[in-house]
């Protein structure tokens, strides 16, 4: 029942792992139903070493997994949203359209 895709573990350094918190800091509610309004810490890797990680997508840090993932823009996929999905036509399709 577990499916994992496009996830990268940021390198752990000691000071980071010692900085545990009782609760992630929340943004004010609102926007996108308030979902993902949490979790905007100074140590968010998406704002540091992973800020340019997602080529055609949005970097997201998942605290539970201590991992970074990319939410790709439409038509892009891959670990870093660097691959574009191409719509291909078969030989039959192209011959029918002539």
């Amino acid at each position: 029942s577990v499916r994992v895709e496009q996830v990268v573990k940021p390198p752990q350094n000691k000071t980071e792992s010692e900085n545990t918190s009782d609760k992630p800091k929340r943004k004010k509610k609102g926007g996108k139903n308030g979902k993902n309004r949490r979790n905007r810490k100074k140590k968010n890797p998406c704002n540091a070493e992973f800020q340019n990680f997602c080529i055609h997508g949005e970097c997201k840090y998942i605290e539970h997994l201590e991992a970074v993932t990319c939410k790709c823009q439409q038509e892009y996929f891959g670990e870093r949203c660097g691959e574009k999905s191409m719509k291909t036509h078969s030989m039959i399709d192209s011959s029918l359209s002539k």
Epitope: R38, I62, L65
Partner: antibody
Framework: EVQLVESGGGLVKPGGSLRLSCAAS????????MSWVRQAPGKGLEWVST????????YYPDSVKGRFTISRDNAKNSLYLQMNSLRAEDTAVYYC??????????????????WGQGTLVTVSS | DIVMTQSPDSLAVSLGERATINCKSS??????????LNWYQQKPGQPPKLLIY???NRESGVPDRFSGSGSGTDFTLTISSLQAEDVAVYYC??????????FGQGTKLEIK
């Protein structure tokens, strides 16, 4: 086969301390966030604490914050809950639970997919 | 905090009949068309068991008479044809990334 086995429960006086343990087996422990959930006698489920895969992030409800501390030892496949300043209202069966998850298209969906049998904590003078 | 409220508190249904349990959240648990809502079954003397995750996905091994539906703030667990072994307490739980990770108060399902 995934197994979670809690231990450390018992009778303790108000203001006392107790340390619960959860021994995990049958899965890659350091790939999953883990939680403690409790259930007072005859009552519903109450989330108590969560810890991230490597222990860098911990979460608590206001009811236990400052009194309870969750930790994990990935080398020993073990989860812990240190409970201090215990109160009568902390009396409950404490369950250890694994966070199963789906991660796709930038979305993270999680749920408690495996639970231990629980350990009873009784706080009474 | 997101508050989860289940209805009814208890329910008696005849064997073979449909059972419906509702769960309402104090604010939306949806994001971009995804619902962050799970259902659990707890039989007497046992730990809870995951039935449905992400509102409508049945956990492996769960009989297909169990189904989940809904979005936003309103969700439903349906048992299409009640069996004797379905007698239990059922809980909904929101699994947004926002703690506290709250449960509903539970619905006790019995046989009429």
């Amino acid at each position: 086969e995934v197994q979670l086995v809690e231990s450390g429960g018992g009778l303790v006086k108000p203001g006392g301390s107790l340390r619960l343990s959860c021994a995990a087996s049958g899965f890659t422990f350091n790939s999953y966030a883990m939680s403690w959930v409790r259930q007072a006698p005859g009552k519903g489920l109450e989330w108590v604490s969560t810890i991230s895969t490597g222990g860098s992030h911990t979460y608590y409800p206001d009811s236990v914050k400052g009194r309870f501390t969750i930790s994990r030892d990935n080398a020993k496949n073990s989860l812990y809950l240190q409970m201090n300043s215990l109160r009568a209202e902390d009396t409950a069966v404490y369950y250890c639970a694994r966070h199963g998850y789906l991660l796709y298209d930038g979305y993270y969906e999680w749920y408690f997919d495996y639970w231990g049998q629980g350990t009873l904590v009784t706080v009474s003078s | 905090d997101i508050v989860m409220t289940q209805s009814p508190d208890s329910l008696a249904v005849s064997l073979g009949e449909r059972a419906t349990i509702n769960c309402k959240s104090s604010q939306s648990v949806d994001y971009d068309g995804h619902s962050f809502l799970n259902w659990y079954q707890q039989k007497p003397g046992q730990p809870p068991k995951l039935l449905i995750y992400a509102a409508s996905n049945r956990e492996s091994g769960v009989p297909d008479r169990f189904s989940g539906s809904g979005s936003g703030t309103d969700f439903t667990l349906t048992i299409s044809s009640l069996q004797a072994e379905d007698v239990a307490v059922y809980y909904c739980q929101q699994s947004t990334e926002d703690p506290p990770y709250t449960f509903g108060q539970g619905t006790k399902l019995e046989i009429k």
